[in-house]
């Protein structure tokens, strides 16, 4: 006697008004009398349309939060798998049942924001910038809203960056306990003349810091040819051990560059009558802290004074 | 779900070449970090190589600075180690491990099955 | 570079047993200490970071303390899929194992 059990009830995706973080929900199946006592899990796959590879979740609760890229659908199935100590051993699923949730498709296209870039600077505030839309009339403005988990709803930015008086960016600061989790943007517009295309997206803000640059460099040669080179990490609240460095050393008219996690450096001199000695740096948050970073402006840079020449005094 | 598929394994003299590639599947690949981390016959493990999301930074253990490089093809969603002049200390099991992070910190969430790589002449 | 050492190399417990397996790093690296699992012909997995954070999935009886050179892994009571190799791993500065340690049946 073959034993079925049937799939979960209900399955639906919805929008709670988070920017792309989505509830995935169901209810139980309806289950026959001499299974009622049996343990059930539930077999979620998930994905956006576009993507290529489902991400799967084994649970036994009835709901799933995760975040998603809302400029594209989203499809979901789940099945019921009834525990093998129910089933002789055996393997039991219910088949596949379907959700899906579809973007809105109001505006077209055009009218959406181009190159949105973000920036976290420092690990302090972070910066968002657009373009508008290719074709929008000149009425259009565009608003950001943003979320991430700690906050009870979406919120708007309060400080727009601002061209020929339309937003073009946002400033935010005071993001408190807002790393090391999905940060949701969504950025819609409005305009009398036509309806607008919101653009949405998703990042964590570790992996977007830009540094200041390392500060206090100072330059010596020891023994007439080690080239001893030190740096400051730059102030602010990022942890030393977070900072990977890039050194471009100069002399006369050779440079080379060179890169590590510590703040000093010693290399051998190339050339020992060489009378001009310099170096610059710069940094970016590495690998032990996040999973990609940009890279700071460059410092000053600092020249070794040591060197005496012929028309020295 | 996440899935790390490691290929490129096998057997060659010392002093060759080989490349390996990790298939990445189930997460978003670009967004991440990803190492290998090798596991000599009978031994414990070592960390070799590691790589930021975008492939800008690159990071070696000593022991192989200079002869190992790593990258990746965030369109194919595919890790490389490219290995070169190899030696007998470098035969081991070569794992491809994806990075996660919490404060200030890391570690490795997720692992492939390893591929065999046997420097011997 | 910073070495960790794990004590003991191998361990001989009974299902029901408390175990506890230490490491030690070769300079401070505060909290920043992984421990993992690993099976025969399997890969490692991950079941303690930042030094004590139970990894998503884990079973609640392993656990983890300690900060600065000292570190323990405690498992409360052994179950007989827990007889492995554990190893502990420092993510301060480069990152680097300890040489592991294989706990066995008794």
């Known amino acids: 006697l073959e034993i079925k059990v049937n799939p979960p009830q209900d399955f639906e995706i919805l929008d709670p008004g988070l920017l792309g973080y989505l509830y995935l929900q169901w209810k139980p199946p309806v289950v026959i009398e001499k299974f009622k006592g049996c343990t059930l899990e539930y077999e979620l796959k998930y994905r956006n349309v576009d993507s290529d590879s489902w991400k799967t979740i084994i649970t036994r609760n009835l709901i799933y939060k995760d975040g998603f890229d809302l400029n594209k659908g989203i499809e979901g199935k789940i099945r019921t798998h009834l525990s093998e100590h129910c089933t002789n051993g055996s393997e039991v699923q219910s088949p596949w049942i379907e959700a899906s949730y579809g973007i809105s498709d109001e505006g077209s296209l055009e009218t959406k924001i181009q190159d949105m870039k973000c920036i976290y600077y420092n690990w302090q505030y972070l910066v968002c910038s657009w373009k508008p839309g290719k074709t929008v009339y000149s009425d259009t403005n565009y608003t950001m809203f943003f979320w991430y988990e700690g906050l009870d709803h979406a919120l708007q930015c309060a400080d727009y960056l601002q061209h020929d008086e339309k937003n073009v960016g946002c400033k935010l600061s005071n993001l408190d306990s807002s790393d090391y989790k999905d940060f949701f943007i969504c950025v819609n517009g409005s305009s009398k003349l036509e309806p607008i295309r919101s653009s949405y997206t998703v990042f964590q803000l570790q992996n977007i810091v830009k540094p200041l640059p390392p500060e206090f460099l100072h330059i010596s040669v020891e023994n007439s040819i080690d080239i001893r080179m030190k740096w400051s990490t730059p102030g602010g609240p990022i942890p030393p051990r977070c900072y990977t460095y890039e050194i471009v050393i100069r002399e006369d008219d050779i440079s080379w560059e060179s890169a590590t996690d510590k703040n000093d450096m010693k290399l051998k001199r190339r050339a020992n009558e060489s009378e001009d000695l310099c170096f610059f740096v710069r940094c970016k948050v590495n690998i032990y802290c996040a999973d990609d970073g940009i890279w700071s402006e460059w410092s000053e840079e600092e020249c070794w004074e040591g060197y005496t020449g012929p028309d020295s005094k | 779900e996440v899935q790390l598929l490691e290929s490129g394994g096998g057997l060659v003299q010392p002093g060759g070449s080989l490349r390996l590639s990790c298939a990445a599947s189930g997460f978003t690949f670009s967004s991440y970090a990803m190492s290998w981390v090798r596991q000599a016959p009978g031994k414990g493990l070592e960390w070799v190589s590691a790589i930021s999301g975008s492939g800008g930074s690159t990071y070696y253990a000593d022991s192989v600075k200079g002869r190992f490089t790593i990258s990746r093809d965030n369109s194919k969603n595919t890790l490389y180690l490219q290995m070169n002049s190899l030696r007998a200390e470098d035969t081991a099991v070569y794992y491809c491990?994806?990075?996660?992070?919490?404060?200030?910190?890391?570690?490795?969430?997720?692992w492939g099955q390893g591929t065999l790589v046997t420097v011997s002449s | 570079d910073i070495q960790m050492t794990q004590s003991p190399s191998s361990l001989s417990a009974s299902v029901g047993d408390r175990v506890t397996i230490t490491c030690r790093a070769s300079q401070s690296i505060s909290s920043y200490l992984n421990w993992y699992q690993q099976k025969p012909g399997k890969a490692p997995k991950l079941l303690i970071y930042a030094a004590s954070s139970l990894q998503s999935g884990v079973p609640s009886r392993f656990s983890g303390s300690g900060s600065g050179t000292d570190f323990t892994l405690t498992i409360s009571s052994l179950q007989p899929e827990d007889f492995a190799t554990y190893y502990c791993?420092?993510?301060?500065?480069?990152?680097?194992f300890g040489q592991g340690t294989k706990l066995e049946i008794k």
């Open positions: 491990a994806r990075y996660g992070h919490y404060a200030y910190g890391s570690y490795f969430d997720y």
């Open positions: 791993q420092q993510d301060y500065y480069l990152f680097t």
